[in-house]
């Protein structure tokens, strides 16, 4: 019969790859003991006297270790061993998707520690400490309300992380306007235009998280391409939530995405969920010469070449650096493609 003391197991954290010696409580060195892990006997050659010696700890070494007096099978001591790593410098980023209400900061560790971590966030606006309210759903996010809009005073957000094996920290400093980044536009829909084989009508909505589009209007950036090609075409729109593509190719399925940005400040949102549409494919009636001329003048681009280069921020390229890139960067390898080329492509 195995008798178990009432005490909870001793919890011990050890570093991955290290060696550890587990004592059998306060048993003497020469006490005759047997060790088990998760109920399985351990080899006697792992013992140094009454102590258990584990070399080169792996994640699989985590478990409940128990030592028993060999004769009576009395449970002498239990150790709940957790193998893990100290935290590396956390990755911290802040973003305002609800400007001018406030912003949120989120964080993560670049590599797992395999053991519990505690994060502590502090936010300073100048010398004033601000409250960062924990997100009810996301444990690695907290929210800060803007107290002074259009402030030139910088924010400093610091995060420290600690676990049983170590501690690390990082901080970022930024201006209020640099972190403004709306959520992607919502409900992007593309429809064919009856009797117009080169037109697609695209509509979308301002992101619902953007609190005041009247006072803080957004501009939009649309990209589209036939599924069979890799190059995107781009259109920047200063206002409105609709656009008609006039240079689509008949019968080719298109993928369309939209991004948003505050008119004045911040960076482009990520791309919206993709909308798919195929232009009207029935053989169109013969158009008048005037109609053909009008068709040509309303076309955004006459080919799949990029539009005129203006410095814009590509939503798809945005990382932590939030750099500005040109449309040449967006398009990848840019070359003119004729309709003849298009018809020679086959779906993959």
């Amino acid at each position: 019969q195995r008798h178990s003391p009432q005490e909870a197991p001793h919890v011990q954290y050890e570093r991955l790859g290290s060696d550890v010696t587990l004592p059998c409580g306060t048993a003497n060195w020469d006490a005759a003991v047997t060790w088990r892990v998760n109920g399985t006997d351990l080899a006697p050659d792992l013992l140094n006297g009454s102590q258990l010696v584990l070399h080169g700890l792996e994640l699989g070494h985590s478990g409940l270790y128990a030592c028993f007096h060999r004769d009576s099978w009395h449970l002498r001591h239990q150790v709940l061993l957790h193998v893990g790593l100290p935290p590396r410098e956390p990755v911290l980023s802040c973003r305002s998707n609800t400007y001018p209400k406030g912003f949120y900061c989120s964080w993560h560790l670049p590599t797992p520690t395999y053991i519990p971590n505690t994060f502590n966030v502090t936010v300073l606006h100048g010398s004033k400490i601000m409250v960062c309210e924990k997100d009810p759903a996301l444990k690695n996010r907290c929210h800060i309300r803007y107290m002074h809009l259009f402030s030139t005073i910088k924010y400093k957000v610091s995060i420290s992380v600690s676990n049983a094996l170590g501690h690390n920290a990082t901080a970022i400093t930024f201006d209020e306007f640099t972190i403004v980044k709306p959520d992607p536009p919502e409900n992007v829909v593309a429809r064919p235009v009856p009797s117009n084989p080169r037109r697609l009508e695209v509509t979308w909505q301002t992101p619902s998280t953007w609190p005041d589009p009247e006072s803080f209007p957004l501009k939009f950036f649309l990209r589209y391409r036939p599924l069979i090609l890799d190059q995107w075409q781009h259109v920047e729109l200063s206002d409105g939530t609709a656009h008609t593509i006039t240079d689509a190719y008949a019968g080719k399925e298109y993928i369309i995405q939209v991004a948003a940005k505050d008119n004045e400040i911040g960076t482009w949102s990520d791309w919206s969920v993709a909308a798919h549409a195929t232009p009207w494919t029935e053989e169109p009636r013969h158009l008048t010469t005037e109609a053909q001329a009008a068709e040509t003048t309303t076309s955004t681009t006459s080919s799949l070449a990029p539009p005129p280069t203006t410095k814009i921020c590509d939503p798809g390229e945005l990382g932590s650096e939030q750099k500005l890139i040109s449309e040449e960067d967006l398009g990848g390898e840019q070359k003119l493609i004729s309709e003849e080329d298009l018809h020679h492509h086959h779906h993959h």
Epitope: H3, P5, P23, G25, T26, N28, D30, A31, S72
Partner: antibody, heavy 120, light 108 residues
Framework: QVQLVESGGDVVQPGRSLRLSCAAS????????MHWVRQPPGKGLEWVTI????????YYADSVKGRFTISRDNSKNTVFLQMNSLRTEDTGFYYC?????????????WGQGTLVTVSS | DIQMTQSPSSLSASVGDRVTITCRAS??????LNWYQQKPGKAPKLLIY???SLQSGVPSRFSGSGSGTDFTLTISSLQPEDFATYYC??????????FGQGTRLEIK
Amino acid sequence: QVQLVESGGDVVQPGRSLRLSCAASGFTFSYYGMHWVRQPPGKGLEWVTIISFDGSQKYYADSVKGRFTISRDNSKNTVFLQMNSLRTEDTGFYYCAAQSSTWPEYFQYWGQGTLVTVSS
Amino acid sequence: DIQMTQSPSSLSASVGDRVTITCRASQSISSYLNWYQQKPGKAPKLLIYAASSLQSGVPSRFSGSGSGTDFTLTISSLQPEDFATYYCQQSYSTPPITFGQGTRLEIK
């Protein structure tokens, strides 16, 4: 011949400190968990603290936790009891004892005791 | 923590008497109980370990029994040198180690 010899007992005022020593001989000291057990005058035995054979594990009675510290020097076959913030109720004979390696553990070897008197 | 209660606290007996001292644990301690004898001005001395095992060098008139929560120390025929204080001690769930409050055995 096994011997445990305690020393360091004295008369001290409440709030003061005292350090007891226990010198061991006649057995492999570094294999044994060592205890301090005390006995107020005319009263029963009270366990105070234990230190494991290698010094890695230490436990204390609630009555002394945070005030007393046990330590050992295996190279000198000696165990120590550092007693801080002494109270009148700490008065008594202090024995060091070596625990058995068999189960159930018992106090295999005892010293003769040293008297600690805490009085103003 | 496990509490140990001895009874009686003291008793008077004569040489040759059979004497029984009991010890009760506040919860089951299997057979992990030890008995000590202490004479005035001396350190305690182990008599019985594991409830019923006689320590080497201890006279056979001493015996122990019991398991779980109730234990007894019996001296079958008291000798003059047996007048002392007796303590039980549990080593089932430690630390802390706990002793009974002691039973003082006096000459009648």
